[in-house]
């Protein structure tokens, strides 16, 4: 908790790591051959930059930021990734008809830098 202390984006509004929603069809996702429903998914994903201390997931992320400043060619900046997920249920095609299947890591719920 101590590490994740920066929620102010120094790069300006909407530029740092955040939850972003994209409306996508089954065709867009390449799922049309095995998923029947929903036909459209509001895909929530994590997008944006991870400047110093911004939503740092842990001390490792802070170290990564510091070393990236010193050695940008060697150490990459922290990445914006899901901190947790919302589950989603899909109606899928099966050999015998249709079935329900739940996925617990499909949609981002919130984001952090790691």
């Amino acid at each position: 908790a101590r590490a994740r202390n920066g929620d102010h984006c120094p790069l300006g509004p909407g530029r740092c790591c955040r939850l972003h929603t994209v409306r996508a069809s089954l065709e867009d996702l390449g799922w049309a051959d095995w998923v029947l429903s929903p036909r459209e998914v509001q895909v929530t994903m994590c997008i944006g930059a991870c400047p110093s201390r911004f939503r740092a997931a842990n001390m490792h992320a802070q170290i990564k930021t510091s070393l990236h400043r010193l050695k940008p060619d060697t150490v990459p900046a922290p990445c914006c990734v899901p901190a947790s997920y919302n589950p989603m249920v899909l109606i899928q095609k099966t050999d015998t008809g249709v079935s329900l299947q739940t996925y617990d890591d499909l949609l981002a719920k919130d984001c952090h830098c790691i």
Epitope: S37, P38, N86, P87, T102, D104, L107
Partner: antibody, heavy 119, light 110 residues
């Protein structure tokens, strides 16, 4: 305002057929799945099945497979639950419910339809 | 017999805090989510908590949900007379799809 309005109470005899309805309004009916839930007198909730009104794909709980039929008519934003031959043990309150966006929970419920089967 | 196990009844005095447990297994709560519904006497169920700990708009913050391992719980603080109702947990099970707990009757004393 999202609303699910169910048809009125029914009293039937064993062996008779029945079709009850659930009309959705205040939202895009084809964008959300509809589920049916049974509550027998003094008992808990039991999931019966789900339908995607846009493609009429249906999936049933193993406990209700072959016992009931779930259907929908998207032109009138209505889902249905039907029996071809009722039994006394079908006496219960039946609720339709709309699934939330991710298909994992029921965010709006109908008022329920009480079905009584008695000779 | 429900896949998810809840106590049949709990009670508390106005203003108190009560919790309702929901016990499952590794094939349901253990790997997935839990939702909670409130059913006031003579009415349809109403969504109270979804995806473990999220409240729909309009639900007071006196209601909160949590999940740990294969169990979940619903906490109600500042108990009020109008909270007297049946409460159901609901999850997903790999064999039965959507499953409910057997329900817990909450009685507000006094």
């Amino acid at each position: 305002e999202v609303q699910l309005v169910q048809s009125g109470a029914e009293v039937k005899k064993p062996g008779e057929s029945l079709k009850i309805s659930c009309k959705g309004s205040g939202y895009s009916f084809t964008s959300y799945w509809i589920g049916w839930v049974r509550q027998m007198p003094g008992k808990g909730l039991e999931w019966m099945g789900v339908i995607d009104p846009s493609g009429s794909y249906t999936i049933y709980s193993p406990s209700f497979q072959g016992q009931v039929t779930i259907s929908a008519d998207k032109s009138i934003s209505t889902a249905y639950l039907q029996w071809s031959s009722l039994k006394a043990s079908d006496t219960a309150m039946y609720y339709c419910a709309r699934y939330g966006r991710y298909g994992t929970y029921f965010d709006y419920w109908g008022q329920g339809t009480l079905v009584t089967v008695s000779s | 017999q429900s896949v998810l196990t809840q106590p049949p009844s709990v009670s508390g005095a106005p203003g108190q805090r009560v919790t309702i447990s929901c016990s499952g297994s590794s094939s349901n709560i253990g790997v997935l989510y839990v939702n909670w519904y409130q059913q006031l006497p003579g009415t349809a169920p109403k969504l109270l908590i979804y995806s473990n700990d999220n409240r729909p708009s309009g639900v007071p913050d006196r209601f909160s949900g949590s999940k740990s391992g294969t169990s979940a719980s619903l906490a109600i603080t500042g108990l009020q007379a109008e909270d007297e109702a049946d409460y159901y947990c609901q999850s997903w099970d790999s064999s039965s799809n959507y499953v409910f707990g057997g329900g817990t009757k909450l009685t507000v004393l006094g």
